[in-house]
């Protein structure tokens, strides 16, 4: 029978090395065997390149195309082929369809004044246009209470978020994940980062540690502060361990 495209290709670029196009066929298709997506930069001397699509679902195909470091003027001509039959033809401008890379290495650290410091890495090298354009959304959720979740918008430059432990339930396990977008490029959101999980043991700090904590932490040097956090982490670890085994 004839091969038809049900939903034409939708493409996004990470604006550094890769563009991804996805489309849906009108029936289950072996994408890599039956289809090819050709792409060519609209630039003098540019060669034609071919992308072999993979199946995302029975009838959904996805093609990941290596591109050079994108610039605003870049426009690609795309042609979807089934053998000698041209199924679809269109153009794609990466700068107008940006989906940032996923932020990486999300970690949670205890910080001064009963706060948690969430840190992650900017997925772009400093020389890339997007490095300084990203803002982030951090989602913090209680692993045991679906209604206990918070969303934080990080619109300043640094990939960090300070979170007061008192805003979270004491003794609860929390997970955080982060995603990025680039406002000036009117991008879509990136995929969420993998989650990182930690135990929030906030109240009462004094009883739990068995000694008072100066507040504010006046006269306490960083070594003393580290000792407190190490002790706190050990207690948390033991509690968590105990919790999981009994």
């Amino acid at each position: 029978g004839s091969v038809k495209v049900l939903h034409e290709p939708s493409c996004f670029s990470d604006y550094i090395s890769t563009s991804v196009c996805q489309w849906k066929m009108d029936h289950p298709t072996n994408c890599s065997a039956e289809l090819r997506l050709s792409y060519q930069l609209d630039f003098m001397g540019s060669e034609n390149h071919t992308c072999v699509p993979e199946n995302r679902e029975d009838s959904v195909c996805v093609c990941s195309m290596p591109i050079d470091d994108a610039v605003e003027a870049d426009v690609y001509q795309l042609d979807l082929w089934a053998g000698q039959q041209l199924l679809w033809s269109g153009s794609f401008q990466p700068s107008k369809h940006v989906k940032p890379r996923t932020p990486g290495n999300l970690t949670v650290h205890p910080n001064i004044s009963h706060t948690w410091l969430l840190m992650w890495t900017n997925p772009y090298p400093t020389e890339n246009h997007l490095h300084s354009e990203l803002t982030y959304m951090v989602n913090v959720s209680n692993d045991n209470d679906p209604e206990d979740f918070k969303v934080y918008n990080v619109t300043y430059m640094g990939p960090t978020l300070r979170l007061a432990a008192s805003t979270l339930k004491s003794g609860a396990s929390y997970s955080a994940r982060v995603r990025a977008w680039a406002q000036t490029y009117n991008s879509t959101w990136s995929d969420w980062s993998p989650s990182t999980t930690w135990l929030n043991y906030y109240e009462p700090w004094e009883q739990h540690l068995g000694k008072p904590i100066p507040n504010p932490l006046l006269g306490l040097d960083s070594t003393g502060l580290n000792d407190i956090f190490e002790a706190q982490k050990i207690e948390w670890h033991e509690h968590h361990h105990h919790h999981h085994h009994h």
Partner: antibody, heavy 125, light 112 residues
Framework: EVQLVESGGDLVKPGGSLRLSCVAS????????MTWVRQAPGKGLQWVSL????????YYADAVKGRFTISRDNAKNTLYLQMNSLRAEDTAVYYC??????????????????WGQGTLVTVSS | DIVMTQTPLSLSVSPGETASISCRSS???????????LDWYLQKPGQSPQGLIY???KRASGVPDRFSGSGSGTDFTLRISRVEANDTGVYYC?????????FGQGTKLEIK
């Protein structure tokens, strides 16, 4: 050493045909676009045609479109210009030159960084 | 087609002086930041042309730093400082952005 050597220039009558060759050495020929430029006696330079590294893309000046055909044989490191329906105004020295690197998605541009010595084409009755 | 216009068409300069040649394009040659597809070539008497400057300001291999290119968009300049007798010839600008690539009319540099 990067080198280009043209040949095939000759005296030909109007309406006649001629094929120019340009043999390249000293660089990875298939990775680069190649260009033909001509210069009529006592005149300036005129861009004629470009072909991408694989030979898949070709471009022509309006003055030669439909009459000239650029091609290449990457196995022989040779560039060609097939010239048909020649006119008196095609009389010129024809130079081949190495153009942009086209094996990358966006060609890397260095200008016309090496030129041949040229071959003279004279169209006259 | 993009039209390239050079000025002046001829120039006479004494050795040691600076020569400046202007090239103007009918459309912008700026593709992206820092990438102006404008070249400068020199054709010495009886020789093939040779590349001097590409992408507006980058010197070709082996070209002395006396030769410098500047400009962006539609207005470009080639400067030759401390001119030598060996710099005699015809200088051409060329746009490499759009097909057909096009040359300026050429500027003849004469050393006094």
């Amino acid at each position: 050493e990067v080198q280009l050597v043209e040949s095939g220039g000759d005296l030909v009558k109007p309406g006649g045909s001629l094929r120019l060759s340009c043999v390249a050495s000293g660089f990875t020929f298939r990775d680069y676009a190649m260009t033909w430029v001509r210069q009529a006696p006592g005149k300036g330079l005129q861009w004629v045609s470009l072909i991408s590294g694989s030979g898949g893309k070709t471009y022509y000046a309006d003055a030669v479109k439909g009459r000239f055909t650029i091609s290449r044989d990457n196995a022989k490191n040779t560039l060609y210009l097939q010239m048909n329906s020649l006119r008196a105004e095609d009389t010129a020295v024809y130079y081949c030159a190495v153009d942009r690197l086209t094996k990358t998605i966006r060609p890397q541009y260095y200008g016309l960084w090496v030129w041949g010595q040229g071959t003279l084409v004279t169209v006259s009755s | 087609d993009i039209v390239m216009t050079q000025t002046p068409l001829s120039l006479s300069v004494s050795p040691g002086e600076t020569a400046s040649i202007s090239c103007r394009s009918s459309q912008s040659l700026l593709y992206s930041i820092g990438y102006n597809y404008l070249d400068w070539y020199l054709q010495k008497p009886g020789q093939s042309p040779q590349g001097l400057i590409y992408l507006g300001s980058k010197r070709a291999s082996g070209v002395p730093d006396r030769f410098s290119g500047s400009g962006s968009g539609t207005d470009f300049t080639l400067r030759i400082s401390r001119v030598e007798a060996n710099d005699t010839g015809v200088y051409y600008c060329m746009q490499g952005l759009q097909s057909p690539n096009t040359f300026g009319q050429g500027t003849k540099l004469e050393i006094k």
